[in-house]
């Protein structure tokens, strides 16, 4: 008789999750010489220890502390790019502009990007059938708590000018409930961060509106200003041209507004 298993509303753990995390860790440490000292087996043990045998709605930031500690790395604090609802373009950008980093360019972000995982209380099994959904089940689930924890630490590490890429095609360009709006904004350190510069990415080819005047951007400006951090905003009207000009800044067409 199969044992009764909790049915959650979200998709289950990504198949081959342990193998994927370990393989990603090995690949990352091979590509990044400054992380060659990292023991990937220990990283996996710490990752596993954060959620295995625990109720998947009762995960805390403290559960991830060993993983955070083992995965700590040096990222230039003035080269941080945050993003909200526009991950692909942000990653395309840092793949070209190699001296800038999104969270997913760090070891811990790279390990977990696009993966889902959860366990079950009092068993050492990984749940491949279903995992808690943030809205329908619970917010203190393994995936949500992981991203909240790494995002907080990433924002805390930032200094000087921090950039954030925002999706101008969405109804809420700045969303207070996103990871950026609920975690990263509030963990930028005013004594280290001088300016938050928002890049609002336009979707439509003929969209010439100044989206920096959007009410949600004004809300972001207000939150940031109250935290004694300066705010600036730029429209990126042509994201394709923007990326092209990052690749080839000397191109004659790159002098005009992008």
């Amino acid at each position: 008789v199969p044992r009764w298993r909790q049915q959650w509303s979200g998709p289950g753990t990504t198949k081959r999750f342990p193998e994927t995390v370990l393989a990603r860790c090995v690949k990352y440490t091979e590509i990044h010489p400054e992380m060659r000292h990292v023991d990937c087996q220990s990283v996996w043990d710490a990752f596993k220890g954060a959620f295995i045998s625990k109720h998947p709605c009762n995960i805390t930031e403290e559960d991830y502390q060993p993983l955070m500690k083992l995965g700590t790395q040096t990222v230039p604090c003035n080269k941080i790019l945050l993003w909200s609802r526009i991950k692909d373009l942000a990653h395309q950008f840092t793949q070209v502009q190699r001296d800038m980093f999104t969270l997913e360019d760090t070891l811990l972000g790279y390990l977990a990007d696009d993966l889902t995982w959860c366990g079950e209380f009092n068993t050492s099994k990984i749940n491949y059938q279903s995992c808690p959904d943030w809205r329908k089940d619970c917010s203190n689930n393994p995936v949500s708590v992981f991203w909240k924890t790494v995002s907080r630490r990433f924002a805390e590490a930032a200094c000087d000018v921090v950039h954030v890429m925002l999706n101008g095609s969405r109804s809420k360009i700045f969303d207070k409930n996103s990871t950026f709006g609920s975690v990263e904004v509030h963990n930028l350190q005013p004594e280290k961060v001088q300016t938050l510069e928002a890049w609002v990415i336009h979707g439509g080819r003929e969209d010439s509106r100044d989206l920096c005047q959007d009410p949600t951007i004004k809300e972001l400006e207000s939150i940031i200003s109250k935290r004694n951090i300066q705010f600036s905003c730029k429209n990126i009207y042509r994201p394709d041209k923007f990326l092209q000009c990052v690749k080839n800044p000397e191109d004659s067409s790159c002098t005009s507004e992008i």
Partner: antibody
Framework: QVQLVQSGAEVKKPGSSVKVSCKAS????????IEWVRQAPGQGLEWIGD????????DYNEKFKGRATITADESTSTAYMELSSLRSEDTAVYYC??????????WGQGTLVTVSS | DIQMTQSPSSLSASVGDRVTITCHAS??????LGWYQQKPGKAPKLLIY???NLHTGVPSRFSGSGSGTDFTLTISSLQPEDFATYYC?????????FGQGTKVEIK
């Protein structure tokens, strides 16, 4: 080989501050946590806090928050632990150690701090 | 804070004896346990990390086992240089905490 060399013994008055240094060599200073631990005479080991020199991340034992400040200077591969508002109970040997797999693999020789009026 | 309880607090043994020291954590610490040896007037030395991994240069007579809440340090055949105080330490959560120590004396 990995080495951590600490500053010399200090005698301090109650209410004053002490700053202990820990110079690292034989490895990449920015890649590993530096832990600070103390040991009162005839007592066990007590963790004070730590720093990741490459990113300036610090964590402290709540017991020492507000009194202990841990810093690092990448240019000299040196970590520092400053303890303020000293009292007689702070008399101890203070150690720095390098973090490894959530343990401490190499230790400094220790710095005796005596707090006495 | 996680409490680490070592037993015994002290023991007397002879050269060649097999010695076992245990460490109990007040909550699950997975495998994040280190064992240290300390001699009078000296800094502690790491023997075992991650519950069972022998640190570089440590003789193979030392071994560690356990996970979760209960851990053991074993010295298979006690040598004269092994008379010292031994500490366990958890690295699962802040603040890191140590056991109270086990003093191994000559019988």
């Amino acid at each position: 080989q990995v080495q951590l060399v600490q500053s010399g013994a200090e005698v301090k008055k109650p209410g004053s501050s002490v700053k202990v240094s820990c110079k690292a060599s034989g490895y990449t200073f920015t890649n590993h946590w530096i832990e600070w631990v103390r040991q009162a005479p005839g007592q066990g080991l007590e963790w004070i806090g730590d720093i990741f020199p490459g990113g300036g991340y610090t964590d402290y034992n709540e017991k020492f928050k507000g009194r202990a400040t841990i810093t690092a200077d990448e240019s000299t591969s040196t970590a520092y632990m400053e303890l303020s508002s000293l009292r007689s109970e702070d008399t101890a040997v203070y150690y720095c150690a390098r973090g490894r797999d959530l343990a401490m693999d190499y230790w400094g020789q220790g710095t005796l701090v005596t707090v006495s009026s | 804070d996680i409490q680490m309880t070592q037993s015994p607090s002290s023991l007397s043994a002879s050269v060649g004896d097999r010695v076992t020291i245990t460490c109990h954590a007040s909550q699950n610490i997975n495998v994040w346990l280190g064992w240290y040896q300390q001699k009078p007037g000296k800094a502690p030395k790491l023997l075992i990390y991650k519950a069972s991994n022998l640190h570089t240069g440590v003789p193979s007579r030392f071994s560690g086992s356990g996970s979760g809440t209960d851990f053991t340090l074993t010295i298979s055949s006690l040598q004269p240089e092994d008379f010292a105080t031994y500490y366990c330490q958890q690295g699962q959560s802040y603040p890191y905490t140590f056991g109270q120590g086990t003093k191994v004396e000559i019988k």
